[in-house]
């Protein structure tokens, strides 16, 4: 007869690992008990098991709880046992010795491979803002055993560097992406995968990208000079920018303080019925975390009386 | 060689404890279970309970349950088992013994320790 | 009262053969190994057969051991005045979650 076995045994961590054993023996041979011990290079041979033909199993200390037979129905010929909730130190080398009858004893060894599931984790770099050279957007770590595989999906274009810390049975890997930051990128994600032997599927995990950035400020309002004129109503002058965070807005006057019945609403100055009170250099003033911007406008009120047209100088300043 | 060395005579007044020690050696003292055996003067042997070595964790015969407490010093190959509320009749030699056969993992004693002779007497 | 029923006393001369019963139920020898341990006067216990009729190294096989349903017997063969000693069987009783004896057989060699 022979003993049949595997080479390598696999199991994700946690899970139970089936040891196999069977003796194909010829007609009229049985098994008197199966012996199991962990055999390590360098160690001593640790016993798990004992598989007796008549009394069943007997556990050694050290695996109590821990190891069974296979659930019915078995065979009598079959030494096999289970490993319950597989922990990465149940790595290794395993040996089955089997004692027939009348064929004497038998042994094989397999490798048990216990897999760990990464838990990866994403961390973010320090904030992004618009004129930064190459920046870290975001690092991924992810450990487990074997090594994992970690990169990026993004639409997003920059580089990556990988490195690789090995412990004594896992390994940990790092991935970082790195990109110069602009305006286009804000809100486009940047997800990490990482793949793993232990892994159903990839494990994904996104980070939404937020760049800092604030454009020129202008003023809308003044493009037809002729509709400023003694009287109008409804007349309104609007800050226009746009930024990441999103920036607030001010209003001031250059040459005074604003005219009473002016309104600030948020971008927008919003005007009573004009009078020649309300000539004047406006500075609308636009800020955020990152920076701030300025554009003045002046105004100049048409008197319909007068003949003399209307000139608006309109200046823009940073 | 492989051997189990208990503890000297002991002496007890009723209602005392007392506490015998067994020290292994010659084997790895967290891969076999240590069991403990009485045999009162002109009787039998009687099983008292069972510890493991490595998780500590213990049974006992019903008749000893609430008065035996059996621990275990792994950094001394050394196993406890301690007697409550003693009576008379618990007057014994007490013996601690290893399981198992030729280092397979076998239902049976191969090592016994030398015994402690336990005296409970006002 | 022990839990296993063995014979107090045997008796046999030199030389010759001599048998020691040992009797159970279903949930210790029926189900389980027996064992059989020799005590010399004043000594502690020795492992003589196990596993119902194996030998640990160094025992004679002059011993031996057999098991039929719930009863055990122990034969010693050849008998010297060195065998005289007292003879206890074991098993695990699954009831008893626990090791039990009997009480004991006291063998005279004649």
């Known amino acids: 007869g022979e003993l049949e076995t595997s080479d390598v045994v696999t199991v994700v961590l946690g899970q139970d690992a089936k040891l196999p054993c069977f003796y194909r023996g010829d007609s009229g041979e049985q098994v008197g008990q199966v012996a199991w011990a962990r055999v390590d290079a360098g160690e001593g041979a640790q016993e798990l098991a004992l598989l007796h033909s008549k009394y069943g199993l007997h556990v050694s200390p050290a695996y109590e709880g821990r190891v069974e037979q296979p659930p019915p129905p078995r065979n009598p010929l079959d030494g096999s046992v289970l490993l319950r909730n597989a922990v990465q130190a149940d790595e290794g080398e395993y040996e089955c010795r089997v004692s027939t009858f009348p064929a004497g004893s038998f042994q094989a060894r397999l490798r048990l491979r216990v897999l760990v599931p990464p838990l990866p984790s994403l961390n973010p770099g320090p904030a992004l803002e618009e004129g930064q050279g190459l920046t870290l957007a975001a690092s991924c770590t992810a450990e487990g055993s074997p090594a994992p595989s970690v990169t990026w999906d993004t639409e997003v274009k920059g580089t990556t560097s990988s490195r690789s810390f090995k412990h004594s049975r896992s390994a940990a890997v790092t991935s970082e992406f790195h990109l110069v930051p602009s305006r286009s990128m804000n809100g486009q994600p940047l997800t990490c995968v990482v793949s793993h032997p232990g892994l159903l599927q990839d494990q994904r995990i996104t980070h939404i990208l937020h760049v800092s950035f604030l454009a020129e400020a202008s003023v809308r309002g003044l493009e037809d000079q002729n509709l400023w004129h003694i009287g109008r109503e409804g007349a309104m002058l609007k800050c226009l920018s746009e930024g990441q965070p999103p920036p607030s807005y001010n209003w001031t006057r250059l040459d005074g303080p604003l005219p009473s019945g002016v309104r600030v609403d948020g971008d927008t100055l919003g005007f009573p019925p004009l009078t020649t009170e309300h000539s004047g250099i406006y500075v609308c003033h636009v800020s955020n975390e990152f920076s701030s911007r300025d554009s003045q406008v002046t105004v100049d009120v048409l008197d319909p009386q007068e003949d003399s047209g209307k000139q608006v100088d309109l200046v823009s300043a940073s | 060689q492989v051997q189990l060395v208990q503890s000297g005579a002991e002496v007890k007044k009723p209602g005392a404890s007392v506490k015998v020690s067994c020290k292994a050696s010659?084997?790895?003292?967290?891969?076999?279970?240590i069991h403990w055996v009485r045999q009162a003067p002109g009787q039998g042997l009687e099983w008292m309970g069972i510890i493991n070595p490595i998780s500590g964790r213990t049974s006992s015969a019903q008749k000893f349950q609430g008065r035996v407490t059996m621990t275990r010093d792994t950094s001394t190959s050394t196993v406890y088992m301690e007697l409550s509320s003693l009576r008379s009749e618990d007057t014994a030699v007490y013996y601690c013994?290893?399981?198992?056969?030729?280092?397979?993992?076998?239902?049976?004693?191969?090592?016994w320790g030398q015994g402690t002779l336990v005296t409970v007497s006002s | 009262q022990s839990v296993l029923t063995q014979p107090p006393s045997v008796s046999e001369a030199p030389r010759q053969r001599v048998t020691i019963s040992c009797s159970g139920s279903?949930?210790?020898?029926?189900?389980?190994?027996v064992n059989w341990y020799q005590q010399l006067p004043g000594k502690a216990p020795k492992l003589l057969i196990y596993?119902?009729?194996l030998l640990p190294s160094g025992v004679s096989d002059r011993f031996s051991g057999s098991k039929s349903g719930t009863s055990a017997s122990l034969a010693i063969s050849g008998l010297q005045s060195e065998d005289e000693a007292d003879y206890y069987c074991a098993a695990w009783d699954d009831s008893l979650n626990g090791f039990v004896f009997g009480g004991g057989t006291k063998l005279t060699v004649l």
């Open positions: 013994a290893k399981e198992g056969v030729g280092g397979e993992l076998l239902r049976a004693f191969d090592i």
């Open positions: 279903s949930s210790n020898i029926g189900n389980n190994a």
């Open positions: 010659g084997y790895t003292f967290t891969s076999y279970y």
């Open positions: 596993y119902d009729d």
